[in-house]
Each structure stands twice: as C-alpha cells, then as structure tokens.
C-alpha cells in the first residue's frame, strides 16, 4: 500500500517526502520552503503571510491588493530568521 503525492505531473513517494519534506512544495504564493529541525518553514514572498504563506497581506484602508514590503518574510519572523 504505497502512498504517493501528485504534484506537477510528478509522483512523490512517502520516502521522498521523509528525505525532503519540501519536495511536495507546501509553501503557497512563491514562498520558499526550508527543512528546519522543528519542521518545515515557509519564507513568504512579499505581500503574503501565514504558516504556508497562504494569506495575502491587506494594508489598512482594506485595499483588495496585497501589500508588498521588500524582501522575503518568513511565516513566523520571531522564530526562524
């Protein structure tokens, strides 16, 4: 009973994921994935936030467009960078 994760026309086995947890590309919106001793870390692209970089940042004034501060920002700036 061999489990596979389908991603971009590629089959990724459970063994592959154990060896490289970032293989499944878990970070959203162009976030960079890093394998950290305590688990995965997503460093978010400008204008995104969240553990998976799943949320667009909304500035005050509630524009529907995400803000774009310079540089990559981790999902958790306090813990990881």
């Amino acid at each position: 009973d061999h489990h596979h994760h389908h991603h971009e026309q590629k089959l990724i086995s459970e063994e592959d994921l154990r060896a490289d947890p970032c293989a499944a590309r878990p970070c959203a919106h162009g976030g960079r994935c890093y394998a950290h001793f305590s688990g995965l870390v997503c460093a978010c692209a400008p204008g995104y936030m969240g553990a998976r970089c799943e949320f667009p940042v909304h500035p005050d004034g509630a524009s529907a467009l995400p803000a774009a501060p310079p540089g990559l920002r981790p999902g958790d700036p306090q813990r990881y960078l």
Partner: antibody
C-alpha cells in the same frame, strides 16, 4: 494557562460600527497568529481575518474587505476587531482564536469566550 | 474557496455506540490541514483532531481522525454522554479558512 478574554456584548443600530477586543494571557502574544471568526444564529462558523501580532500584518476574508479592520496592541497583548456599516445579518457571536505559526499547527487551538453583537433598529 | 460538506447533518446514536462523521472538500485540502472541532451550547469550539489525524492536547483516544485529499472522517469509537454535541471540520491550508456546516450528534 492560555486565556483569551473578550469584551462584553454589544447592541448596535444598522449603519453603526462596533469594536470587539480580545486580551491574551498565559502565552507569548507575538509568537502566535490571532484570528477572528463569527457564528451567526444557528450553526455555522465564518472566518473573518488574521493578524500577526509580531509585525501587525493582516489579511481579511474577501467578503469583509472595506468593512473590517483588525489591529493589535502589543503592550497589552490585545487584538481588536472593528466592523463598520453594520447590518442585521452581522448579528452573531464573534470569537477571537489563537493559531500556531509553525507549519501544520495553524489551526485554532484556543478560543475566546465569544462576544454577542446584536444589530437591530 | 474550498467548500466543506459534512454528513450526516444529524446523527442519532446511543452511548457506547460508534460514531462516524464525514467531511468532504470541494478540492484537495493542502497538506491535509484539516481540523475537527467539538462545540457545546454557549461554548466556543474546541479542537479534537488536527492535521487530519493528530489528536489535540488532552483529547481522549476514543476520538480518531483519518482521510486525505478531499475526504476526511472523524470516528468516536465508543460514545460517552459528554460526546453529544455539534462537530465542525475546518480546513486551514488555504485562504480563506473555511468550515463545514456542522454535524449534530444527538442521543437516540
């Protein structure tokens, strides 16, 4: 232990605004995300938005854009929800909820007790 | 947005019986980031299972979660009187976070 204590019930008229607060204790405020979720009469939960207290970044559900603001005061470990242009459909219990920042742990592990907001003319 | 559909809407069982609650997503849930909550009247929801199958702190082992992709199940192996409540699933993989409409577990 972790506690999220919310402000008291509010009664508002249509078109008015409401501010709900949520004070966190028993944890490092900036190490967690804070969310707002509402529950209208009867079952049904609706996510409204998130704030990262460490940097103040926030994101809102599309349906609330332009009508909601989430803010935080790190000196008192408090987050705030402001909802504007209230209508009768906004009558609900509003919850704050804490979520982990670690990958895979961003579910709502602690919730406030809820704040009933009633919108009625 | 991801729509979560829970079934059944109401489940009528007796203490000691086994309960099986279903949560189906309109598309695959990223990284199986799905959580089950229990809610009792006048209270906030409390997490039971997160990551589809990991028990939250302090949750008895009669509660278990399974499933992946778009199909998830919460099982209560032997119902206790305090288990009769409202149960919600929620995905926390993609924005906006969304909830199922709930399953009411009532005493038969």
């Amino acid at each position: 232990q972790v506690q999220l204590v919310q402000s008291g019930a509010e009664v508002k008229k249509p078109g008015a605004s409401v501010k709900v607060s949520c004070k966190a204790s028993g944890n490092t405020f900036t190490n967690y995300y804070m969310h707002w979720v509402r529950q209208a009469p009867g079952p049904g939960l609706e996510w409204m938005g998130i704030i990262d207290p460490s940097v103040g970044s926030k994101s809102y559900a599309q349906k609330f854009l332009g009508r909601v603001t989430i803010a935080r005061d790190t000196s008192t470990s408090t987050v705030f929800l402001d909802l504007y242009s209230l209508r009768s459909e906004d009558t609900a219990v509003y919850f704050c909820a804490r979520a982990g920042k670690r990958f895979g742990e961003s579910y709502f592990d602690y919730w406030g007790q809820g704040t009933l907001v009633t919108v009625s003319s | 947005e991801i729509v979560l559909t829970q079934s059944p809407g109401t489940l009528s069982l007796s203490p000691g019986e086994r309960a099986t609650l279903s949560c189906r997503a309109s598309q695959s849930v990223s990284s199986n980031f799905l959580v089950w909550y229990q809610q009792k009247p006048g209270q906030a929801p409390r997490p039971l299972i997160y990551g589809a199958s990991t028990r939250a702190s302090g949750i008895p082992d009669r509660f278990s979660g399974s499933g992946s992709g778009a199909d998830f199940t919460l099982t209560i192996s032997r119902l206790e009187p305090e288990d009769f409540a409202l149960y919600y699933c929620q995905q926390y993989g993609d924005s906006p976070y969304t909830f199922g409409q709930g399953t009411t577990l009532e005493i038969k």
